[in-house]
Interface confidence: medium
């Protein structure tokens, strides 16, 4: 329904609070190199400005659309050329195509200084000092460094961020007490971050179809006892909820997700048994539980797959009748039925069953030509099946660390020229599908491993578009959306590549390791053996480990010493020099 | 939730025509499809022909066809059987059914919502 004022409508909607906190996040997702300051006053102007809009809807410029408004608004930042360069140019294009020009320049990899956490005590005085401001910070930092996080749920973050705070800094032991809850909430944010890109991405590259059918296959598992009509609905309504939010409409995907949790919770005896916690809970709380809640039980009597979909002779009929329809509900049935699938393997049997009709739908016999179908789904399903058995038995035996440590190795093979700092991220991402996954029984492995490493990859593919250096990576991440994880997974060592020359340099290290946390510790070992690796890509497994065995004792022993700078420089030297003998280079 | 109450049933001679209609109301959809059933007395439910709602393509069971046509009003949200050349074995409870979706169905299973029915009965 149209409304005089856009930017009045969604003020009233989401009321001043949250108006300004999703304002904030769209500006600094935009323009993620401007100071908090000076977002700040942007964000000021824009809020004052919409009470005028409520006020008076026929008021001059109430009546523009929400990207003219915010737009024009970016443009007034005075330093727009220097800091940004040739993003100033999508200020002389016109609506919608400046938003575009806007989305085109958002960065991933922002040149940014790491967050670096303030002691308790100084973190606490600020929140009590000025506890808006603090919570503003938060949304910006987040923001900026995450251009794509899911505004709506970035508002719930800020919510147990502040929380937090609110309940910590009263506490006996504030540290003890706050420290556990930021860790969570950093590991939690940068995993909601990762899996809103693979929407985004999905959206953006593969466009609404795949979104769309990803859509179909989740909520049809977690909804299984849903009508078709009723998984389709929602599913219309979530692709425009993150079209929006992808798009940098904020505001009006923060309210259309609010009407959909609304309309869930108001129909939850025709979606789903396990919503009622969810929808008992406030507006923010209620959204991210209805996004994370349990599957459903399956219904108990649903009939074979195979009568409506290989042994009905109506099959190219209906299929013919309208094809997006008809996968769509192979789509819903297959996925009800299989919970215990990746989604992304869902989606894999729904395009070989869309192949097969295409082709049999023509042939002169198509019931004899498709009858075969569901033999194909075999070698589909067994491959996640045996991949996700062989990386759960690894890791079980080596653990996290070295688990990571062997991705590291192998991706490291398989696309020498991608940089190390992206090649260390994501191989330690993917190792963490170890702990993440392999403690699950069989009938959860596969859809919490595959759809994890989904995401994990797609950090990959959006970090490699930035500045493609390798075609392999640039195939697997363009091809298929849903063949990307078997994609890499097929990747042998690429024997094209011709092995970094040497630098000590790079394998000097100083006492400042010792004062790092472990984390950071293990960071630093593995972006050697990343090194490593590309100087001598035929380097075994065992030569590999004794070098990186003879490196950790080598730290050990020169953060032990007195004189740890002298023990760095002079073990440094033997080790380099003994870890050049053992790989011959 | 759909809501499907089928109306014009009654009492005719063979030979004579009737109009049934099938007012759907609750959800729409993007696709729907609108199946015709019969129940005889002493009989199984037996299916007499359905409509993909999109796209206005019909099919029905042989002993109907030629005889019944299926037909839609999208404005009114009603889709009607008009039933020809009625025979004494015709006589049943006939209901209307919808699914969503889209399929040539032929059986109960596939469809989700049901009408009360309306009787109709055909005397020699």
């Known amino acids: 329904d149209a409304h005089k004022s856009e930017v009045a409508h969604r003020f009233k909607d989401l009321g001043e609070e949250n108006f300004k906190a999703l304002v904030l996040i769209a500006f600094a997702q935009y323009l993620q190199q401007c100071p908090f300051e000076d977002h700040v006053k942007l964000v000021n102007e824009v809020t004052e400005f919409a009470k005028t809009c409520v006020a008076d809807e026929s008021a001059e410029n109430c009546d523009k659309s929400l990207h003219t408004l915010f737009g024009d608004k970016l443009c007034t930042v005075a330093t727009l050329r220097e800091t940004y360069g040739e993003m100033a140019d999508c200020c002389a294009k016109q609506e919608p195509e400046r938003n575009e020009c806007f989305l085109q320049h958002k960065d991933d990899n922002p040149n940014l200084p790491r967050l670096v956490r303030p002691e308790v005590d100084v973190m606490c005085t600020a929140f009590h000092d000025n506890e808006e401001t603090f919570l503003k910070k938060y949304l910006y930092e987040i923001a900026r460094r995450h251009p794509y996080f899911y505004a709506p749920e970035l508002l719930f973050f800020a919510k147990r961020y502040k929380a937090a705070f609110t309940e910590c800094c009263q506490a006996a032991d504030k540290a003890a007490c706050l420290l556990p809850k930021l860790d969570e909430l950093r590991d939690e944010g940068k995993a909601s971050s990762a899996k809103q890109r693979l929407k985004c991405a999905s959206l953006q590259k593969f466009g609404e179809r795949a979104f769309k059918a990803w859509a179909v296959a989740r909520l049809s598992q977690r909804f299984p006892k849903a009508e078709f009509a009723e998984v389709s609905k929602l599913v219309t309504d979530l692709t425009k909820v993150h079209t929006e939010c992808c798009h940098g409409d904020l505001l009006e995907c923060a309210d259309d997700r609010a009407d959909l949790a609304k309309y869930i919770c108001e129909n939850q005896d025709s979606i789903s048994s396990k919503l009622k916690e969810c929808c008992e809970k406030p507006l923010l709380e209620k959204s991210h539980c209805i996004a994370e809640v349990e599957n459903d039980e399956m219904p108990a009597d649903l009939p074979s797959l195979a009568a409506d979909f290989v042994e009905s002779k109506d099959v190219c009929k209906n299929y013919a009748e309208a094809k997006d329809v008809f996968l769509g509900m192979f789509l819903y049935e297959y996925a009800r039925r299989h919970p215990d699938y990746s989604v992304v393997l869902l989606l894999r049997l729904a395009k070989t069953y869309e192949t097969t009709l295409e082709k049999c739908c023509a042939a002169a016999d198509p019931h004899e030509c498709y009858a075969k179908v569901f033999d194909e789904f075999k070698p589909l399903v067994e491959e996640p099946q045996n991949l996700i058995k062989q990386n759960c038995e690894l890791f079980e035996q080596l653990g996290e660390y070295k688990f990571q440590n062997a991705l590291l190795v192998r991706y490291t093979k398989k696309v020498p020229q991608v940089s190390t700092p992206t090649l260390v991220e994501v191989s330690r991402n993917l190792g963490k599908v170890g702990s993440k996954c392999c403690k699950h029984p069989e009938a959860k492995r596969m859809p919490c491993a595959e759809d994890y490493l989904s995401v994990v990859l797609n950090q990959l593919c959006v970090l490699h578009e930035k500045t493609p250096v390798s075609d392999r990576v640039t195939k697997c991440c363009t091809e298929s959306l849903v063949n990307r994880r078997p994609c890499f997974s097929a990747l042998e060592v690429d024997e094209t590549y011709v092995p970094k020359e040497f630098n000590a340099e790079t394998f000097t290290f100083h006492a400042d390791i010792c004062t790092l946390s472990e984390k950071e510790r293990q960071i630093k070992k593995q972006t050697a053996l990343v090194e490593l690796v590309k100087h001598k890509p035929k380097a075994t497994k065992e030569q590999l480990k004794a070098v990186m065995d003879d490196f950790a004792a080598f730290v050990e022993k020169c953060c032990k010493a007195d004189d740890k700078e002298t023990c760095f420089a002079e073990e440094g030297k033997k080790l380099v020099a003994a870890s050049q003998a053992a790989l011959g280079l | 939730e759909v809501q499907l109450v089928e109306s014009g049933g009654g009492l005719v001679q063979a030979g004579d025509s009737l109009r049934l209609s099938c007012a759907a109301s609750?959800?729409?959809?993007?696709?729907?499809?609108m199946g015709w059933f019969r129940r005889a007395p002493g009989k199984e439910r037996e299916f007499v022909g359905g409509?993909?709602?999109?796209?206005?393509?019909?099919w029905y069971t042989d002993s109907v066809l030629g005889r019944f046509t299926i037909s839609r009003d999208n404005a009114k949200n009603t889709v009607y059987l008009q039933m020809n050349s009625l025979k004494p074995e015709d006589t049943a409870v006939y209901y209307c059914?919808?699914?969503?979706?889209?399929?040539?169905?032929?059986?109960?299973?596939?469809?989700?919502?049901w009408g009360q029915g309306t009787q109709v009965t055909v005397s020699s």
């Open positions: 059914a919808t699914a969503a979706g889209v399929g040539y169905y032929r059986y109960e299973r596939q469809y989700d919502y």
């Open positions: 609750g959800r729409p959809f993007m696709s729907y499809v």
């Open positions: 409509i993909n709602w999109g796209s206005g393509n019909t």
